[in-house]
Interface confidence: low
């Protein structure tokens, strides 16, 4: 009996964008303003996310999907679904608990986010420094001194920088 009753549950007929209203004989009522249901058979609608303050609206809430937020200029998203906004810094800086700080000598950051990373040690690859590093840029490694002869290969470009704060998912 229980199984039969659950198979005939009238709430299962309520589509996304509605909820099964127990106060009205389990009929399907539209989600109220500023709420949504993304799946059928819901007994309540969820409150829409509000993108306030440092968050701004990337996608408006609809009756079937939540709002999506991103961050105002000067900030970037962190966390699943942009649950947090973190302050941007300038290239050549990293964000600390006390705000943006310049990269220490020997480190660089070519992004507006993430941390300062050490310059590449060219000598580990048997190469020499062709262009010195700065707070904003890694060193450029060149051919080893022994290779500096006619017909030697061209300069090795630095590896592309990663964005530490960016989720690969």
């Amino acid at each position: 009996f229980e199984r039969t009753r659950s198979l005939q549950d009238p709430c299962s007929n309520c589509p996304a964008g509605t909820f099964c209203d127990n106060n009205r004989n389990q009929i399907c009522s539209p989600c109220p303003p500023n709420s949504f249901s993304s799946a059928g058979g819901q007994r309540t609608c969820d409150i829409c996310r509000q993108c306030k303050g440092v968050f701004r609206t990337r996608k408006e809430c609809s009756s079937t999907s939540n709002a999506e937020c991103d961050c105002t200029p000067g900030f970037h998203c962190l966390g699943a679904g942009c649950s947090m906004c973190e302050q941007d810094c300038k290239q050549g800086q990293e964000l600390t608990k006390k705000g943006c700080k310049d990269c220490c000598f020997g480190t660089f950051n070519d992004q507006k986010r993430g941390i300062c990373r050490p310059w590449t040690n060219c000598s580990l690859d048997g190469k020499s420094v062709l262009v010195n590093g700065t707070k904003e840029r890694d060193v450029v490694c060149g051919p080893s001194p022994a290779d500096l002869s006619p017909g030697a290969s061209s300069v090795t470009p630095p590896a592309p920088a990663r964005e530490p704060g960016h989720s690969p998912q």
Epitope: G53, L78, S83, E94, G114, I115, P164
Partner: antibody, heavy 130, light 110 residues
């Protein structure tokens, strides 16, 4: 004194759900993120997820997506962690742990949790057995 | 997201210094300065001893220190004492917007 008090021992059957509570006292509950961490017997620590008690926003470890729900009741300064479809591998001590950093309202400010867990509950032992 | 790699056990005599390593990837330890260390004694909840790679919470002995190089973080305990015998765990924020712990290291004071 700042402390987190969790529910006692829970014994559940496979397939059931468990809801663990964590009552905070001695600080402003809505100003600090809360993490949930579990530890199976003789094993290491495993991060499950985080909730911002101010706005109720959550982020879960991929392993628990779809099975875990973290909620809070600001009127009682209590955080909850519900885990469904329990299996024997879920037998563990479940800890709530406060994030060290002081947060801002999720909807009006910005804040990155430090991920340093400075205050821990004593843990709730959940045993899943048929 | 895989657990960070820690040695299963380390040991040292009273008065000595020991170092516990915690190796991750550029997506966690190497990408952020959000590395923490915890001490856990048997039957107890973990206790925060280092956060933000190098910072000690108030009340934690200055015998505990943290550092990081590349994708490996380290916890050093100097002037080892019998009461330091415990399990130690590292953790890090990750680019997947989550946190991950190390497998834990059992410290034995000989």
């Amino acid at each position: 004194e700042v402390q987190l008090v969790e529910t006692g021992v829970e014994v559940k059957k496979p397939g059931a759900s468990v809801k663990v509570s964590c009552k905070a006292s001695g600080y402003t509950f809505t100003s600090y993120y809360m993490h949930w961490v579990r530890q199976a017997p003789g094993q290491g620590l495993e991060w499950m997820g985080i909730i911002n008690p101010s706005g109720g926003s959550t982020s879960y470890a991929q392993k628990f997506q779809g099975r875990v729900t973290m909620t809070r009741d600001t009127s009682t300064s209590t955080a909850y962690m519900e885990l469904s479809s329990l299996r024997s591998e879920d037998t563990a001590v479940y800890y709530c742990a406060r994030d060290l950093g002081e947060g801002y309202d999720f909807w009006s400010g910005y804040y990155t949790p430090s991920g340093a867990f400075d205050i821990w509950g004593k843990g709730t032992m959940v045993t899943v057995s048929s | 997201q895989s657990a960070l790699t820690q040695p299963a056990s380390v040991s040292g005599s009273p008065g000595q210094s020991i170092t516990i390593s915690c190796t991750g990837t550029s997506s966690d330890v190497g990408g952020y300065n959000y590395v923490s260390w915890y001490q856990q004694r048997p039957g107890k909840a973990p206790k925060l001893i280092i956060y933000d790679v190098t910072t000690r919470p108030s009340g934690v002995s200055n015998r505990f220190s943290g550092s990081k190089s590349g994708t490996t973080a380290s916890l050093t305990i100097s002037g080892l004492q019998a009461e330091d015998e415990a399990d130690y765990y590292c953790s890090s924020y990750t680019s997947y917007s989550t946190w991950v712990f190390g497998g834990g290291t059992k410290l034995t004071v000989l």
